[in-house]
Interface confidence: medium
């Protein structure tokens, strides 16, 4: 039975050219996290964090994506095209798969606030 829940940074905004942290957290389960996949809105993989084999940033993103903090992901040099949904997929043993959603809005305005509150989607 899957008892866990994914908490995410929810809907966040950041300014063009800046950076943002995408963060998910799995709670309420003792399941072992084997792997976390980070995907973009078009389902392309940004990065993978395997518990034993380590981080892998996909080539298309290696100049703009930094691993961490923790199981999260840092997007740098943001462009307007980065606006959209991001998904964290937790592959766990023995529970199975958990999936969280984050919506990132990249703003032109220099007064854009970067909110980083945790919320359950």
């Amino acid at each position: 039975m899957m008892t866990g829940t994914i908490e995410t940074t929810g809907n966040i905004s950041a300014k063009k050219g800046g950076s943002v942290i995408l963060q998910c957290h799995l709670s309420s389960t003792m399941a072992q996290v084997t792997q976390v996949n980070w995907e973009q809105h078009d389902h392309s993989l940004l990065a993978i964090r395997n518990a034993e084999l380590g981080w892998h940033i996909y080539p298309a993103f290696k100049d703009r994506v930094a691993p961490g903090p923790g199981l999260g992901l840092t997007l740098q040099s943001l462009t307007m095209n980065d606006t959209g949904e991001y998904f964290c997929t937790y592959h766990t043993y023995p529970d199975g798969t958990y999936r969280g959603r984050i919506f990132l809005e990249v703003l032109e305005s220099s007064v854009a606030e970067h909110s980083a509150r945790f919320q359950i989607p």
Partner: antibody, heavy 127, light 107 residues
């Protein structure tokens, strides 16, 4: 720190039996698949057998099928390889290894890579 | 059984040079391919998994590429500790198989 220590190797006559053990520590043994890989003197690596984390499924190389049996005792954190009807060509260093799981989100299946290895135990089959 | 053929059998190079090792599969293994390094008297060490991903702690000078039947391990600039035997392995299906190995030796 993951540690795997093989034992039980030695010199044995053709046709006889031998049981190898692999004592595991530093990880939750019951959560991981385990494998045996061997290497004949001066030769390359040869996969011998695999066993799932709970012992429910076992897989063997054709060269040892029907003669070797892989098993595990999760309460003792130990992997075994029972080798019967030994032949000269079974002479090798036998390594146990622990798999690390990687989920392929394209083919939607897990792959198992051999990340942690013991130092090996030498089995010599000779009359 | 999937047969993996490695070439060349021996590669003689000097420290600082680039090493390119090849592994060819008799049928497609998708990206289910690993590369291991083995030094004399030691157990193998996992370098690359899923054809192109570096395992934890592996230096960036090691890189893997390819999919299907043709794979390459590249060492961008050989360090003294890189002279060893390298094996490819497919984990696409049973029986799991290794290539015959490529020995990278000092020229």
């Amino acid at each position: 720190e993951v540690q795997l220590v093989e034992s039980g190797g030695g010199v044995v006559q053709p046709g006889r039996s031998l049981r190898l053990s692999c004592a595991a520590s530093g990880f939750t043994f019951e959560s991981y698949g385990m494998v045996w890989v061997r290497q004949a003197p001066g030769k390359g690596l040869e996969w011998v057998a695999s066993i799932l984390y709970d012992g429910s499924n076992r897989y063997y190389a054709d060269s040892v099928k029907g003669r070797f049996t892989v098993s595990r005792d999760n309460s003792k954190n130990t992997l075994y390889l029972q080798m019967n009807s030994l032949r000269a060509e079974d002479t090798a260093v036998y390594y146990c290894a622990r798999v690390s799981y990687y989920y392929d989100s394209v083919e939607l299946r897990w792959a198992e890579y051999f990340q942690h290895w013991g130092q090996g135990t030498l089995v010599t089959v000779s009359s | 059984e999937i047969v993996l053929t490695q070439s060349p059998a021996t590669l003689s190079l000097s420290p600082g040079e680039r090493a390119t090792l090849s592994c060819r599969a008799s049928q497609s293994v998708s990206s289910y391919l690993a590369w291991y390094q083995q030094k004399p008297g030691q157990a193998p060490r996992l370098l690359i998994y899923d054809a192109s991903k570096r395992a934890t702690g592996i230096p960036a000078r090691f890189s893997g590429s390819g999919s299907g039947t043709d794979f390459t391990l590249t060492i961008s600039s050989l360090e003294p500790e890189d002279f060893a035997v390298y094996y490819c392995q497919q984990v696409h299906n049973f029986p799991l198989t290794f290539g015959g190995g490529t020995k990278v030796e000092i020229k």
